[in-house]
């Protein structure tokens, strides 16, 4: 076999790695497996970042391509730009470097495109389908500071072998990044483990000054520690232990601090208290106590959904209006009939991390297809067309001339079309108020991939988040989610709110679905009360209307364990919907951050007409929203920017580290 | 010009063996994957499987693994198919093609090049 | 796998019509969608690549379009040299490749 084709690589600089992975993969495998390790897809934007990345690519065959971060939506050519329409997936369009392998050609670019990079010659950038599996990708890892490589040693037995942080073994290092480990191996027969590590006095360091192969006083056997041992002047030696690690009281082994679970999800050494605790992707540490961690709301951020979305603890579902079905994405909507058959069957395909397997995902997957149920429908405003992602970059519009998005009027009660994916009804015991803005902007229609959660112990049953057997082929029947369809009722005109009041039969028995609601409409604001809501099921919740004034809405209280729904009044921060000049975004967007409980699942129409203000549940401050591999999607009209207010906020409401196991909408990209 | 021309027609008895060449020019052999197609009559294409001439990696169509294997002769600029247990059904036209890296800027695996075809006839 | 079904299977036209060729895939495949061309005793020819791409020196009434599951092949005036059977082919799950049972043009 081909050296290039064997094994990962990466080259380091003092601030950032680069890394090769010959792995076969389409565009979304490649994203999520760089996510899975701490990185992204590479974004070479410097001429001195492209040589790094030539460099680490050298001279491989023609015929191999790896992919780079960047990805064009359908429809989104800007020819004259040097990314041509092209979005970094770090969600921007900034570069200093571009390597076309062909001039801008005007067309209409009709498809959704990826960029790929010439293995051989001078490694240009070629486009061409997202779904394609090419032979390898480049990721890209940042971090604190690095490490120098260590200066071999005359007592060494071999040259230091180097971990890094996203599981990278190599001795070809000049650099190492914060978290990486050095093994050195002495012709005495012993050895020394290195980290490189925060130094107290600033900076990063290795945790042991060198020599490190010199001296017998900690020989042999590293004279009892577990650790690094440490010879003394006196001759005698002492243990230390290497950081996120304290000596236990043996005085020669070392205890992990996280080992004693302090954190709810997931604890890394270090600090101030010897640990700190992190939340998994969908979640967010407690502001009460950084141990806990609560759900986000991605149905609060601007358009995780083309129309609307339902939100549940440690993620979301899509769903589309009457005459829409939901797109293979599970995102975008599009009109009844447009898309196959198979769509659901797509995207369980779609989305599986390898192929390895796909047989027998395929028939896991075809096991949900039965399990419809048909429901009374539910009311809902007709959603409105989306706007596009946030550009590093915004074209000027002369005054008259700023894009408008056509706002067909709220259509009362469109009703809600079925899922295409299994609604999961894994056991919640949060409660949340529930509040939905009826302006509540949106991200562009597209098929957004999901986020690949890190790695994560398991969590047990009780704190699952929701499966899709498609990807789990392999779980038993117990874990696998209930699914549910809605059925529309007769709509009354247009315009005219209707006055409902009806009372839905338990339609479900217990361990198979969330019980369904039973909804009031008065005026425009509907409040949802559940009828018996057995343990372990996650209800569904439909909330407000179109059109709300600010005010306190009702915001329901559920939780699973109790079967009565106490319904608390909530003063919820209004957000606010304006146009502006073309020298400001189209859209200000003003989100107060605020503590939120995890998150019951709540059903939101994803948009609705300008200049409007509406009560929105609160939500952490976001920057602008990232770019993301999606699939195929209509052509947005308009970008959307969300305004910064504080500038350590957390970029994205899906932090870095992963979900407990990722259904097919828990993870998307927002 | 690019060219992929195939060896001719076989006749063989259930139970034997093919080997179909397939010897490329006009272009760097190495930097092409080769694949090989086969057309029973009336019947739809069926991919068999891959050769990429760099590194002879190789990745077979499941139905024909076990019984199919696909070889490089660099030094040639020649892809062989070799297969096995040949059976009645295997008669067909089997086509080799080199599958593009690139057409104006973008990456494509579609295949550009076509060899004529070689007529496999099994027949007791 | 991934099944490719052509619609419709046979089709006559005169010299000068347009026509419209069907690839529906059994699940999505984005764009990595080609159209060929065979003629009776010959090899296929590469028309369209990735969906909706012309491949160097096909005339310009061929076109493509479509991505996901739905995929066409045009041909906005027929000339005597394009009565031949068309096939799509996917290439998504490379390099697993599956091709369309192929659409037969014939002259009315």
């Known amino acids: 076999q081909d050296p290039w084709a064997a094994e990962p690589r990466a080259a380091c600089g003092p601030s950032s790695c680069y890394a090769l992975f010959p792995r076969r993969r389409t565009f979304l495998e490649a994203w999520r497996a760089c996510r899975e390790l701490g990185g992204d897809l590479a974004t070479p934007r410097t001429p001195e970042e492209a040589q790094r990345v030539d460099s680490l690519v050298g001279a491989g065959p023609a015929s191999r391509l790896l992919w780079i971060g960047l990805q064009r939506q359908a429809r989104q050519c800007q020819l004259q730009r040097p990314l041509r329409g092209f979005t970094w997936t770090t969600g921007d369009q900034d570069t200093a470097f571009t390597n076309w392998a062909q001039p801008a050609s005007g067309g209409p670019c009709p498809a959704q495109r990826c960029v790929a990079l010439e293995a051989s010659g001078e490694h240009r950038w070629l486009e061409g389908s997202c779904t394609l599996a090419v032979d390898g990708y480049l990721c890209q890892f940042g971090f604190e500071g690095a490490c120098p490589a260590l200066q071999d040693e005359a007592g060494q037995a071999g040259p230091a072998v180097y971990t890094t942080p996203f599981h990278l073994v190599s001795t070809e290092f000049e650099w190492l990044p914060f978290g990486s480990v050095a093994a050195v191996q002495c012709q005495a027969g012993r050895g020394a483990s290195l980290l490189c590590v925060k130094q107290p006095e600033g900076g990063v360091g290795w945790s042991r000054a060198g020599p490190l192969c010199l001296g017998t006083g900690c020989s042999p056997d590293n004279g009892g520690c577990e650790h690094e041992c440490v010879e003394e002047v006196d001759g005698h030696v002492s243990c230390r232990c290497t950081e996120g690690f304290r000596l236990a009281a043996d005085g020669r082994s070392c205890e992990d601090p996280c080992a004693q679970a302090p954190c709810e999800q997931q604890c890394e050494p270090g600090g101030p208290q010897g640990y700190s605790c992190h939340c998994r992707l969908g979640f967010r540490p407690a502001e009460d106590d950084p141990h806990r961690c609560v759900d986000t709301d991605e149905c609060q951020i601007a358009g995780v959904c083309q129309q609307m979305c339902v939100n549940y603890v440690g993620g979301f579902e899509c769903y589309c209006s009457e005459g829409h079905e939901l797109e293979a994405d599970g995102i975008s909507c599009s009109p009844a009939g447009a898309m196959g058959a198979q769509a659901s069957q797509d995207l369980g395909d779609e989305l599986l991390d390898d192929g390895e397997d796909e047989e027998d995902e395929d028939e896991a997957w075809k096991a949900f297809n039965g399990g419809w149920t048909e429901m009374p429908g539910i009311l809902w405003m007709e959603p409105t067309q989306p706007p596009d992602f946030a550009l590093a970059y915004r074209p000027s519009f002369p005054e008259d001339r700023e894009p408008q998005i056509p706002y067909p009027e709220p259509t009362w009660p469109p009703p809600l079309s079925a899922p295409r994916v299994p609604y999961h009804s894994s056991v919640l015991s949060v409660t949340r108020p529930v509040v939905v803005s009826a302006t509540h902007p949106t991200l562009p229609s597209a098929h957004q991939p999901p986020v690949i959660p890190a790695t994560h112990p398991a969590l047990s049953r009780d704190h699952q988040i929701p499966v899709i057997a498609a990807n789990y082929p392999d779980l038993p029947s117990a874990y696998q989610p209930g699914i549910l369809s809605v059925s529309h009722s007769a709509q009354p005109p247009a315009h005219q709110p209707p006055m409902i009041s009806t009372k839905y039969p338990e339609l479900f028995p217990a361990h198979q679905s969330p019980m369904f609601p039973d909804t009031r409409v008065a005026g425009t604001q509907t409040t949802t009360h559940l009828p018996g809501i057995p343990p372990n099921h996650a209800p569904l919740v439909t909330t407000l209307g179109a059109q709300l004034p600010p005010q306190a809405p009702d915001a329901l209280v559920l939780r699973t364990q109790a079967t009565q729904l106490p319904i608390i009044p909530t003063a919820q921060p209004s957000l606010t919907t304006t146009s502006r000049s073309p020298v400001s975004p189209a859209h200000q967007i003003s989100v107060p951050a605020a503590t939120q409980p995890a998150a019951l699942p709540t059903l939101l129409p994803s948009q609705s007409p300008t200049n409007q203000t509406s009560p929105i549940s609160p939500t952490h401050p976001h920057s602008k929203a990232p770019q993301i591999p999606r699939e195929d999607g209509p052509s947005p009209k308009l970008a959307l920017w969300l305004p910064s207010p504080a500038p350590t906020a957390a970029p994205t409401a899906l932090g870095e580290a992963g979900l407990a196991e990722h259904s097919q909408r828990d993870d998307r990209w927002l | 010009q690019v060219q992929l021309v195939q060896s001719g027609p076989e006749v063989k008895k259930p139970g034997a063996s093919v080997k179909l060449s397939c010897k490329a020019s006009?272009?760097?052999?190495?930097?092409?994957?080769i694949h090989w197609v086969k057309q029973a009559p009336g019947q739809r294409l069926e991919w068999m499987g891959y050769?990429?001439?760099?590194?002879?990696?190789?990745t077979y169509n499941q139905k024909f693994k076990g019984r199919v294997t696909i070889t490089v002769d660099t030094s040639a600029s020649t892809a062989y198919m070799e297969l096995n247990s040949l059976r009645s059904e295997d008669t067909a036209v089997y086509y080799c093609?080199?599958?593009?890296?690139?057409?104006?800027?973008?990456?494509?695996?579609?295949?550009?090049?076509w060899g004529q075809g070689t007529l496999v006839t099994v027949s007791s | 796998d991934i099944q490719l079904t052509q619609s419709p299977s046979f089709l006559s036209a005169s010299v000068g019509d347009r026509v419209t060729i069907t690839c529906r895939a059994s699940?999505?495949?984005?764009?990595?969608v080609a159209w060929y061309q065979q003629k009776p005793g010959k090899a296929p020819k590469l028309l369209i690549y990735?969906?909706?791409n012309r491949y160097t020196g096909v005339p310009s009434r061929f076109s493509g379009s479509g991505s996901g599951t739905e995929f066409t092949l045009t041909i906005s005036s027929l000339q005597p040299e394009d009565f031949a059977t068309y096939y799509c082919?996917?290439?998504?799950?490379?390099?697993?490749?599956?091709f369309g049972q192929g659409t037969k043009l014939e002259i009315k």
């Open positions: 093609a080199r599958r593009g890296n690139s057409y104006d800027g973008y990456f494509d695996y579609s295949m550009d090049y």
């Open positions: 006009g272009y760097t052999f190495t930097d092409y994957v």
């Open positions: 050769i990429n001439p760099y590194d002879d990696d190789t």
């Open positions: 699940q999505n495949v984005g764009t990595a």
């Open positions: 990735s969906a909706s």
């Open positions: 082919q996917q290439y998504t799950n490379y390099p697993m490749y599956t």
